[in-house]
C-alpha cells in the first residue's frame, strides 16, 4: 500500500516516542562519532518535519523517501569530513547509493571509550532531573557502539532500563537493587547485539536464501505443530523485517515487526501453543517474548522422513519441480523432529541432502544412488556431539577462567596473526559457552553451544574483515556460513607463522594491576598469555601453565607488598627471565 508521505505514514504507525527513538538509533548507528547533542538536534528537526507531513501529506518534501530525508539530514553535519574522512564522500552520491555508502562505513569496532558507570546516586539524580534525556543518552551510547543492534529490540532494552531506574532509585538500598539489573541488561544487550550481527552478516554476505534457510530451521524447531505453509509465511515476513533493520531502514523494520507480532498473536492456533503468555504483553515486550519463546511440543505422530525423502521414487521429480521448496520442506520436516540439533547442523544436513540429490538425480539409477543418504548424515551429527561432549568435560574440569585460557592457547596457535585484543575478546566469549550451555540437559546442549559459537565466531569474522591479517580466517569466514565453526575447529597450529620477537614491554606490569577488578585482571593475564603463545607457538600446555602460575604468584605477591610499585619493578624482570628460560 503506497502512501503519499512515507515519513507521515511511519510517524502515525509508530507514534512520536518510538519514531524519535528509532531515528536517534539510526543516526547514532550511522554517525558513531558525533556528539549526543548534535544527534538530538537532528532528531528534533526530523520529528518537527514529520509532524508537518502528518498535518499535510502534500507539503513540500513530504513525498521524499526516508533514505533521502535522513541522508540529507546526516549530510548537514558540519564536521563530517574532519570526523569521518572518506565517509563524507557518501554525501556526493544519490540514493540508493548514498545509503549503501553509509552502511559500508558502519564501524563494528569504533574507537570509543568504554562506558564507565557512575555512582548510583549520580545516575539516579540524572534520571530524576531529566528522564527523557537520560534515556535518549542510553539509546545513543548503545547504538553508536553497536551499529547493527536490532533497533526495535533496543527500544525494549531502553524501556527495561527506564523501569530499573524508576524502581531502584526509590529503594532503600539503591545499589543493591540497581546494579544487578544493569549488569543483566549489559550482558543481555551484548548477546542481543552479537546475535543480530550474525543475522545481518548472513543477509549481507550470503544473501537472503541463507537467512531464510536459517529461519526455516529455527522456526520449525520452535513451532513443530505449524504447517510448512505457515512457517514459510513467518520466514518471509521475518526476512523482510531483518533485511530492513540490517539495511538501516529502522522505521519500516519496527513497523513490520509490530505487524508480524500482531499476525502471530491473531493466528496462535496454527502456530504454537506457547504464544499465549506473550500476546497479552505490550508491543515491545510482546515482540521480544515471541522472539525468545520456547519450543512447542513436537506432534506425537510424526512419520519417518525416509518415506518421502529417501524411499519414494519421486524424489528427483519433486526436487526438479521446485528445488528450493522441496529442500525447504525437507529442512522443515527435519528441524521440527530435531530440537536437539543446532540450527547450523540442520543446515549442514540440508546442504548434504541437496548435494546428494544434485549428484544422484543426474544418475541413471537415482534411487539406488540416494538410498543411503541418511547414513551419510551420521558423521555430520556426531562431529558437533563429540565437540560439545569434549569441551563440556574440559569446562567442568577447569572452570571458566582456565577453560578460556585453554581456548586462548588453542585459537592463538590456529591464527596467531590475529590481533591480541581480538583473540582475547573472542576466546573469552567462546569460553562462556561452558557456563551458558554445559549445565543444560543433553537434548539442549548442542543447539545452545553450536549456535552460540556461530555468533561468537561471526564477531571474529566481522573484526577480521575490517583488518584482514590471516588467509585462514578469511577462508573460514567466507567459504560457507554453516561450516564456519567446523572450519575453525579443524584449523591446526600454523606452521608457516614466524614467531613474534620477544618484547619485555609487553610483560612489564605496574601497581595499578592491584586495583583492577577481577575481570580486568583476567584480561591482563590473558593478554600476556596470548603474547606468550605468539612468541612461542610450540610451547606445551605444561610450559604455559607453569609460566601462568608463576605470573599469578608474582602479581599476588606484589599486590600484598607494602611498596607495590617497587615490588613490580624488582620482581617483574625476574618473572620475565624465568619465563623465557622456562619456554626456551
Amino acid at each position: 500500500d503506497t502512501h503519499k508521505s512515507e515519513v507521515a505514514h511511519r510517524f502515525k504507525d509508530l507514534g512520536e516516542e518510538h519514531f524519535k527513538g528509532l531515528v536517534l538509533v539510526a543516526f547514532s548507528q550511522y554517525l558513531q562519532q558525533c556528539p549526543f547533542e548534535e544527534h538530538v538536534k537532528l532528531v528534533n528537526e526530523v520529528t518537527e518535519f514529520a509532524k508537518t507531513c502528518v498535518a499535510d501529506e502534500s507539503a513540500e518534501n513530504c513525498d521524499k523517501s526516508l533514505h533521502t530525508l535522513f541522508g540529507d539530514k546526516l549530510c548537514t553535519v558540519a564536521t563530517l569530513r574532519e570526523t569521518y574522512g572518506e565517509m563524507a564522500d557518501c554525501c556526493a552520491k544519490q540514493e540508493p547509493e548514498r545509503n549503501e555508502c553509509f552502511l559500508q562505513h558502519k564501524d563494528d569496532n569504533p574507537n570509543l571509550p568504554p562506558l564507565v558507570r557512575p555512582e548510583v546516586d549520580v545516575m539516579c539524580t540524572a534520571f530524576h532531573d531529566n528522564e527523557a534525556t537520560f534515556l535518549k543518552k542510553y539509546l545513543y551510547e548503545v547504538a553508536r557502539r553497536h551499529p547493527y543492534f536490532y533497533a526495535p529490540e533496543l527500544l525494549f532494552f531502553a524501556a527495561r532500563y527506564k523501569a530499573a531506574f524508576a524502581e531502584c532509585c526509590q529503594a532503600a538500598d539503591k545499589a543493591a537493587c540497581l546494579l544487578p539489573k544493569l549488569d543483566e541488561l549489559r550482558d543481555e544487550g551484548k548477546a542481543s547485539s552479537a546475535k543480530q550481527r550474525l543475522k545481518c552478516a548472513s543477509l549481507q554476505k550470503f544473501g537472503d536464501r541463507a537467512f531464510k534457510a536459517w529461519a526455516v530451521a529455527r522456526l520449525s524447531q520452535k513451532f513443530p505443530k505449524a504447517e510448512f505453509a505457515e512457517v514459510s509465511k513467518l520466514v518471509t515476513d521475518l526476512t523482510k523485517v531483518h533485511t530492513e533493520c540490517c539495511h538501516g531502514d529502522l522505521l519500516e523494520c519496527a513497523d513490520d515487526r509490530a505487524d508480524l507480532a500482531k499476525y502471530m498473536c491473531e493466528n496462535q492456533d496454527s502456530i504454537s501453543s506457547k504464544l499465549k503468555e506473550c500476546c497479552d504483553k505490550p508491543l515491545l515486550e510482546k515482540s521480544h517474548c515471541l522472539a525468545e519463546v520456547e519450543n512447542d511440543e513436537m506432534p506425537a505422530d510424526l512419520p519417518s522422513l525416509a518415506a518421502d525423502y529417501v524411499e519414494s521414487k519421486d524424489v528427483c521429480k519433486n526436487y526438479a519441480e521446485a528445488k528450493d521448496v522441496f529442500l525447504g520442506m525437507f529442512l522443515y520436516e527435519y528441524a521440527r523432529r530435531h530440537p536437539d540439533y543446532s540450527v547450523m547442523l540442520l543446515l549442514r544436513l540440508a546442504k548434504a541432502y541437496e548435494a546428494t540429490l544434485e549428484k544422484c538425480c543426474a544418475a541413471a539409477d537415482p534411487h539406488e544412488c540416494y538410498a543411503k543418504v541418511f547414513d551419510e548424515f551420521q558423521p555430520l551429527v556426531e562431529e558437533p556431539q563429540n565437540l560439545v561432549k569434549q569441551n563440556c568435560e574440559l569446562f567442568e574440569q577447569l572452570g571458566e577462567y582456565k577453560f578460556q585460557n585453554a581456548l586462548l592457547v588453542r585459537y592463538t596457535k590456529k591464527v596467531p596473526q590475529v590481533s591480541t585484543p581480538t583473540l582475547v575478546e573472542v576466546s573469552r566469549n567462546l569460553g562462556k559457552v561452558g557456563a551458558k550451555c554445559c549445565k543444560l540437559p543433553e537434548a539442549k546442549r548442542m543447539p545452545c553451544a553450536e549456535d552460540y559459537l556461530s555468533v561468537v565466531l561471526n564477531r571474529l569474522c566481522v573484526l577480521h574483515e575490517k583488518t584482514p591479517v590471516s588467509e585462514k580466517v578469511t577462508k573460514c569466514c567466507t567459504e560457507s556460513l554453516v561450516n564456519r565453526r567446523p572450519c575453525f575447529s579443524a584449523l591446526e597450529l600454523d606452521e608457516a607463522y614466524v614467531p613474534k620477537a620477544f618484547n619485555a614491554e609487553t610483560f612489564t606490569f605496574h601497581a595499578d594491576m592491584c586495583t583492577l577488578s577481577e575481570k580486568e585482571k583476567q584480561v591482563k593475564k590473558q593478554t600476556a598469555l596470548v603474547e606468550l603463545v605468539k612468541h612461542k607457538p610450540k610451547a606445551t600446555k605444561e610450559q604455559l601453565k607453569g609460566v601462568m602460575d608463576n605470573f599469578a604468584a608474582f602479581v599476588e605477591k606484589c599486590c600484598k607488598a607494602d611498596d607495590k610499585e617497587a615490588c613490580f619493578a624488582e620482581e617483574g624482570p625476574k618473572f620475565v627471565a624465568a619465563s623465557q628460560a622456562a619456554l626456551a
Epitope: 521414487k313 519421486d314 524424489v315 528427483c316 521429480k317 526436487y319 526438479a320 519441480e321 544434485e358 544422484c360 538425480c361 543426474a362 544418475a363 541413471a364 539409477d365 537415482p366 534411487h367 539406488e368
Partner: nanobody, 115 residues
Framework: QVQLVESGGGLVQPGGSLRLSCAAS????????MSWVRQAPGKGPEWVSA????????RYAETVKGRFTISRDNAKKTLYLQMNSLKPEDTAVYYC????????GSQGTQVTVSS
Amino acid sequence: QVQLVESGGGLVQPGGSLRLSCAASGFSFGSFGMSWVRQAPGKGPEWVSAIDSGGADTRYAETVKGRFTISRDNAKKTLYLQMNSLKPEDTAVYYCTIGRSTSRGSQGTQVTVSS
C-alpha cells in the same frame, strides 16, 4: 512449472519399430537423470529404462533389454526411446519421468502392438 510432453506413439505390427520423444521444459533438464515408464491397461506402472544426465549411463528392464534404446539430446531438452522388435506385450501408455519415478506426471503416448 515442470512439463513433460510425450509423442511418437501409434499402432504398429509385431516386429515393427517406433521412436518416442519426450520434450521437457520448466527445469534444468541437463541436470537430471530421466526414465521411461509404461502402464498397460489394468496394470500398475512398470519402469522401462533410465539414462543419466550426461547420457553415458543407461539401464533397462529385463523385458526390453536388447530391443529398446534410451537416449537424450540436452541441447534440445528431449528424451528418446527407440523401440525395435516390438511385441504385443509392449502395448501400453508410455510416459517419461524425472529420475526413477514411476508416478505419472504427464499424459503419455499410447503404443499399440497388434497384427
